[in-house]
């Protein structure tokens, strides 16, 4: 007779969730000379320690930490990228600008990109069905406490300009409620950081507002002027010609705005 | 590959003020470019550092408030105006670009041939 299954809302663990992780990690670190002293059979087995046999609402920060410290890496404070709602740019951007650092540029993230996964109480089995929806089911599911943790180590790991991209064209340009709202700009380290530099990115051709001054990018600046650290913005009005331009800076067009 | 070639050191009195500049070649965009300095028996130490595209600036805390670091892209010149010099502002001061922080430890990748500036009391 098969065992009833608990129902989640959202889709279940990413198919070959085991295969991908260790092949990730295994490219990872083959393609990064600094992680190659990691153990990429001690970080899947510290990964599936952290959900396996737990209920999948019920997870903490605590249930990571020894991936956190198998994947303890370091990258230069002043390089680093966060963005919201907009990944893609920002991953395009830190291929070509190879040395600056989004959370996906690193070990652990970039193991869980675009992955889902969840276990069963008290059983060894992953879960492929469903996986709690975090509004939903639960906030306290493994996806979520996962990025949580990574994005706060990676925050409080930020100092001098912070870097982050946002996403012009959302009704919310800064939304209080995505990760880096809610998690990473309260663990900037006023004592580290001095500046958060963000940079917005206009969606429309002909888009020539000037969406520094939009009510949530002054949302922002409040928030963070409050951690007693600086606050400055820019206008991306045409990404693809940013991207041209970190590509090929000595172009003439690239003194312009851009 | 960047060049870096700074200018507008010298002698200057003690409450005097300075403006070094460095001209910079080759790739520019998006480089966090700093000034140095280095004193006489000392390690060269940071000073101050600005972001090349968003021109958002940071300094070391013995310069706040009287240093400050500027750059115009359009002559692709980094400045360093220096105000209320004190007699120990006296070092080697260096453009860098490239800048790197791992935790204390600041490097860059591209380095200047430095320009002397001397505050006499």
């Known amino acids: 007779v098969p065992r009833w299954r608990q129902q989640w809302s959202g889709p279940g663990t990413t198919k070959r969730f085991p295969e991908t992780v260790l092949a990730r990690c295994v490219k990872y670190t083959e393609i990064h000379p600094e992680m190659r002293h990691v153990d990429c059979q001690s970080v899947w087995d510290a990964f599936k320690g952290a959900f396996i046999s737990k209920h999948p609402c019920n997870i903490t920060e605590e249930d990571y930490q020894p991936l956190m410290k198998l994947g303890t890496q370091t990258v230069p404070c002043n390089k680093i990228l966060l963005w919201s709602r907009i990944k893609d740019l920002a991953h395009q951007f830190t291929q070509v600008q190879r040395d600056m650092f989004t959370l996906e540029d690193t070990l652990l993230g970039y193991l869980a990109d675009d992955l889902t996964w969840c276990g069963e109480f008290n059983t060894s089995k992953i879960n492929y069905q469903s996986c709690p929806d975090w509004r939903k089911d639960c906030s306290n599911n493994p996806v979520s406490v996962f990025w949580k943790t990574v994005s706060r180590r990676f925050a409080e790991a930020a100092c001098d300009v912070v870097h982050v991209m946002l996403n012009g064209s959302r009704s919310k340009i800064f939304d209080k409620n995505s990760t880096f709202g809610s998690v990473e700009v309260h663990n900037l380290q006023p004592e580290k950081v001095q500046t958060l530099e963000a940079w917005v990115i206009h969606g429309g051709r002909e888009d020539s507002r000037d969406l520094c001054q939009d009510p949530t990018i002054k949302e922002l600046e409040s928030i963070i002027s409050k951690r007693n650290i600086q606050f400055s913005c820019k206008n991306i009005y045409r990404p693809d010609k940013f991207l041209q331009c970190v590509k090929n800076p000595e172009d003439s067009s690239c003194t312009s705005e851009i | 590959q960047v060049q870096l070639q700074e200018s507008g050191g010298g002698l200057v009195q003690a409450g005097g003020s300075v403006r070094l500049s460095c001209a910079i070649s080759?790739?520019?965009?998006?480089?966090?470019m700093g000034w140095f300095r280095q004193a006489p028996g000392k390690e060269r130490e940071f000073q101050a550092g600005i972001t090349w595209f968003g021109g958002s600036t940071y300094y070391a805390d013995s310069v706040k408030g009287r240093f400050t670091i500027s750059r115009d892209n359009t002559k692709n010149t980094l400045y360093l105006q220096m105000n209320s010099l004190k007699p120990e502002d006296t070092a080697i001061y260096y453009c860098?670009?490239?800048?790197?922080?791992?935790?204390?430890?600041?490097?860059?990748?591209?380095w200047g041939q430095g320009t002397q500036v001397t505050v006499s009391s």
């Open positions: 080759g790739r520019t965009f998006i480089n966090d």
């Open positions: 860098a670009a490239g800048l790197k922080r791992i935790g204390d430890q600041r490097e860059a990748d591209y």
